[in-house]
């Protein structure tokens, strides 16, 4: 049986059940290389507390549909009066990066995972030439996830003192110059994740090969190498390579750009101080507030919730958007869709789409940006579920009793962007990270 998601095959992926102190290793096409789980384990459960391993999915006993992968085992599970076997079930959803498998829950018999990934999309619009896993777990099983830094088009310009060259990078994947043909990037060779521009010429100085690595508690490293044979004439016979070290800052701060810290014979060392290198619990919340020792800040957007069936309305040319954030009140236009953001076509109000659901909510504060994300909306033709990204700005004089109002700023590939000036986005900082 052919592998259903070949892009995901090259790596063993990790997922974590933090509540039970369990690390899962997943290889969806072959087997994980862990002796204790046996030679054919596709999903290996490592119980860190008891230091034991259990295979909860066998690569030989795989069954697949377009959006579901199941690995059975021959191990019977303890459900009275049945002869069920332990199994793992991975539900795939379309995403804009390779993404990460997320542990959802487990019963006596089944371990459930969900994976939003380009590999599950109906169309290839989000697929990279080359992309590598972009997250790691530290020794405390906390997730460090750089997926939000991945650019789907364009690139980051590295801060470099050399006026004659410009180094552009992407994170964990190659630079897509077709979707955003900026004049400087247009000449970059396909597949490059590090592109050196000199005058009118552009050179591939690195492609992603291995996934993100954790080198110390708050330092993550990505290594790019030039795969192509044939040396560049300005590299003194060396093969180009790029090392990007992502550093979690010691306290809350605004974002910085990547900086070139060393350069020798086409070996480029880049340091990027960014809160995205910190563990995810430091940056994110599933509720509308971020507070406590762990996050170093106090943010509470819950006063923005609307009651009594009313919604915020944002004009989007062809569409009206109805928003009800930080609550579970149904938007009347989007009846029974559990939508936090509802898109209604002006010319045909029967055309209604959920652009993100209130159960699928993430509040993120990173590098000085406060963002509320609603995902899991109605599918677009690509298979991608509509989502909304609301970027908040602190405004102590916002109207509407300080609440302000969301403003639609645009749409890219079924992701809807809004800005929202409000006094409730004014962040209070603590200092003890």
């Amino acid at each position: 049986q052919a592998a259903p998601f070949p892009e995901l095959c090259s790596y063993t992926w990790e997922a974590v059940d933090t509540k039970n102190n369990v690390l899962y290793k997943i290889n969806i096409c072959g087997s994980v290389d862990i002796v204790q789980c046996g030679p054919s384990s596709a999903v290996c459960m490592h119980d860190l507390k008891t230091r034991t391993y259990h295979s909860v999915g066998d690569s030989v006993l795989r069954s697949a549909t377009r959006s579901l992968l199941e690995f059975n085992t021959t191990v019977s599970c303890d459900q009275q009066g049945t002869n069920h076997r332990v199994q793992s079930s991975i539900a795939f959803l379309c995403g804009k990066t390779l993404g990460t498998p997320e542990f959802v829950t487990a019963t006596e018999c089944v371990h459930y995972f969900e994976w939003r990934t380009t590999a599950a999309c109906k169309k290839d619009i989000f697929k990279a030439n080359k992309e590598v896993p972009c997250y790691v777990f530290d020794e405390e099983l906390r997730k460090h996830d750089l997926n939000p830094l991945i650019k789907l088009s364009g690139a980051y310009l590295v801060d470099d003192s050399d006026p004659d060259t410009s180094l552009f990078i992407n994170v964990c994947r190659d630079i897509d110059t077709l979707r955003d043909p900026g004049s400087q990037l247009r000449a970059c060779p396909p597949g490059t994740a590090a592109c050196l521009v000199r005058g009118h010429q552009a050179f591939d100085v690195g492609q992603p090969r291995d996934g993100l690595k954790l080198v110390r508690k708050d330092r993550l490293v990505l290594s790019y190498v030039r795969e192509e044979a044939g040396k560049l004439d300005f590299c003194d016979g060396h093969s180009p390579a790029v090392t990007i070290t992502f550093v979690c800052p010691s306290e809350r701060r605004e974002g910085t750009i990547p900086k070139l810290t060393a350069k020798s014979n086409c070996r480029y060392e880049i340091e990027w101080i960014t809160e995205y290198a910190c563990h995810r619990d430091y940056l994110e919340s599933k509720t509308c507030s971020l507070s406590g020792e762990q996050q170093d800040v106090s943010i509470d957007l819950t006063p923005l919730a609307q009651s009594g069936g009313s919604s915020y309305i944002s004009d989007g040319k062809e569409y009206l958007f109805y928003l009800n954030v930080c609550g579970e009140t149904e938007i009347q236009f989007c009846n029974k869709k559990q939508a936090a953001v509802c898109q209604v076509k002006k010319s045909d109000t029967s055309q209604v789409k959920a652009a993100g659901r209130y159960h699928n909510q993430t509040l993120r504060y990173s590098d000085g940006d406060l963002t509320l994300i609603y995902f899991g909306g109605d599918e677009c033709s690509s298979g991608f579920q509509r989502m909304s990204v609301i970027n908040f700005e602190c405004n102590k004089t916002a109207g509407n009793d300080g609440k302000g109002t969301p403003v639609f700023t645009g749409e890219v590939d079924c992701t809807y962007f809004f800005t929202w000036d409000t006094e409730y986005a004014c962040v209070h900082h603590h200092h003890h990270h």
Partner: nanobody, 111 residues
Framework: QVQLQESGGGLVQPGGSLRLSCAAS????????MDWYRQAPGKQREWVAT???????TYADSVKDRFTISRDNAKNTVNLYMNSLQPEDTAVYYC?????WGQGTQVTVSS
């Protein structure tokens, strides 16, 4: 304040059965992972069985197919059913949740 209290230990003949219980105050078992450990005289404490918060169960090889761990949410207890007991099962049995431990209950298997 969290307290765990084991009960049900005793003297049993080889091949016999026992049911150990762990009662809790200050913690809700259904939200937490529970483990049973045991310590035989002169030996290190060893893991016996796990009941995760979601319901999956795992057992040490030495007790697999003989011991069963289960939860009674109404009574907020976790039980360890022990069948086909052997002399090598003689030990003090402890229940554990995170950093919290019970005082232990003695199980002796002897004819």
């Amino acid at each position: 304040q969290v307290q765990l209290q084991e009960s049900g230990g005793g003297l049993v003949q080889p091949g016999g059965s026992l049911r150990l219980s762990c009662a809790a105050s200050g913690i809700i078992f259904s939200d937490n992972r529970m483990d049973w450990y045991r310590q035989a005289p002169g030996k290190q404490r060893e893991w016996v069985a796990t009941l995760a918060s979601y319901g999956w169960k795992t057992y040490a090889d030495s007790v697999k197919d003989r011991f069963t761990i289960s939860r009674d949410n109404a009574k907020n207890t976790v039980n360890l059913y022990m069948n086909s007991l052997q002399p090598e099962d003689t030990a003090v049995y402890y229940c554990n949740s995170g950093q919290y431990w019970g005082q232990g209950t003695q199980v002796t298997v002897s004819s």
